[in-house]
Interface confidence: low
Amino acid sequence: DSSKWVFEHPETLYAWEGACVWIPCTYRALDGDLESFILFHNPEYNKNTSKFDGTRLYESTKDGKVPSEQKRVQFLGDKNKNCTLSIHPVHLNDSGQLGLRMESKTEKWMERIHLNVSERPFPPHIQLPPEIQESQEVTLTCLLNFSCYGYPIQLQWLLEGVPMRQAAVTSTSLTIKSVFTRSELKFSPQWSHHGKIVTCQLQDADGKFLSNDTVQLNVKHTPKLEIKVTPSDAIVREGDSVTMTCEVSSSNPEYTTVSWLKDGTSLKKQNTFTLNLREVTKDQSGKYCCQVSNDVGPGRSEEVFLQVQYA
């Protein structure tokens, strides 16, 4: 009667060849203590014999004898509430369904847990916030659906292949709800980080590379500008011509408007990347800069101090 057995455990567990799997599990048998436990691999019910067939990975019989397979497969549970399992090492051919055959004095139950064992270590997954803006602290998260007490791993953050200096906080969960390893890194990206590659690298306890995930940073930032002036020293005589050019070295997203400012005030009808000042007069001396805006906001170049001297 299924209503007499209540199980809690992760639905699917993930591991790779040579690692291990720790299966947190709790149960309740309402009619008394567990008397027999068999762990099957891919169990199939045989109607002729009214029993389950399949590879027996572990068997705990009523008289308490432990088979030699327990060295690799361990039942770490007890008679009434804990059904935690460990397989160490875990092999590719352990993939499939694990069947926990539980028998109490009067009741029997088969509980199924899925096990997914890959040939090679699977990559972690980097999670980024939906939008990243320059100088605003964000949390980068690297999540791996794996954790096992017998197989320590580490997640390392790299920026353009170099270990990131910010301290990451690594947490693990080995509970009936979830099994994972997570690394969180607080990071204040600058505009220069736009387009850079961030890697979360999975390593074993010795620092050996196992797998990785990479993302390209999309750092929203105001336009970054360079101003060039001809003549380069910005010292001219009255009647001379001056050309100032505004160059956008980076903008994310694309820029939308361009304007020029003199002494902090916008110059009317000057909305191109080149400012041509013809036959300048003394009162045109002052501090000039260009301003280019995008959806993030305006970016300003450095100021050029134009000195117009008497002819």
Partner: antibody, heavy 117, light 112 residues
Framework: EVQLQESGPSLVKPSQTLSLTCSVT????????WNWIRKFPGNKLEYMGY???????YYNPSLKSRISITRDTSKNQYYMQLKSVTTEDTATYYC???????????WGQGTSVTVSS | DVVMTQTPLTLSVTIGQPASISCKSS???????????LNWLLQRPGQSPKRLIY???KLDSGVPDRFTGSGSGTDFTLKISRVEAEDLGVYYC?????????FGGGTKLEIK
Amino acid sequence: EVQLQESGPSLVKPSQTLSLTCSVTGDSITSGYWNWIRKFPGNKLEYMGYISYSGSTYYNPSLKSRISITRDTSKNQYYMQLKSVTTEDTATYYCARYPSPDAMNYWGQGTSVTVSS
Amino acid sequence: DVVMTQTPLTLSVTIGQPASISCKSSQSLLDSDGKTYLNWLLQRPGQSPKRLIYLVSKLDSGVPDRFTGSGSGTDFTLKISRVEAEDLGVYYCWQGTHFPWTFGGGTKLEIK
């Protein structure tokens, strides 16, 4: 007060493996970065590598094939092994704590190692 | 690897006089995080190295203010306004911006 103490053999034969221990008191090796640096005769310093609070490692590429840094958190010790040593590995070996992105600010007293047959 | 070049190799100074050590890196030490990881160490005779300055100009706790660090990019300087007897030893610059971290060759400060 944070203290680091290196220990290991003072004399190693060429082709052997040099094994050094750094014992840490006053701080836990599960926080910060824990480094090995060596100083050759003539004052040249070389950075060898670290083991971090999480157990991740970084090795100087010039030593990568020969060096291994491990730890035992229960003893609050970390270790450095250097394989296939030559006379060029004769140096004073220091362990040092790297607690932040700023710099190393706690060093051991250093242990002098001579490689000679 | 980033090469750190220190000059002079030896510096002989009278107590009370100023001293200056130069350190040049083969590439800029300005990190992508906006910080410049240039540090100065002093190794007094018979002692382990001790950090004096980090992030170019920040003095470590307990370091007298006669020490000042300056510079940016690839050129850095350590100055001692008035040398005292306890300042003798070997001074090293080292960079923590690029992996592997590298050290200058050292400058030996002697008292005249």
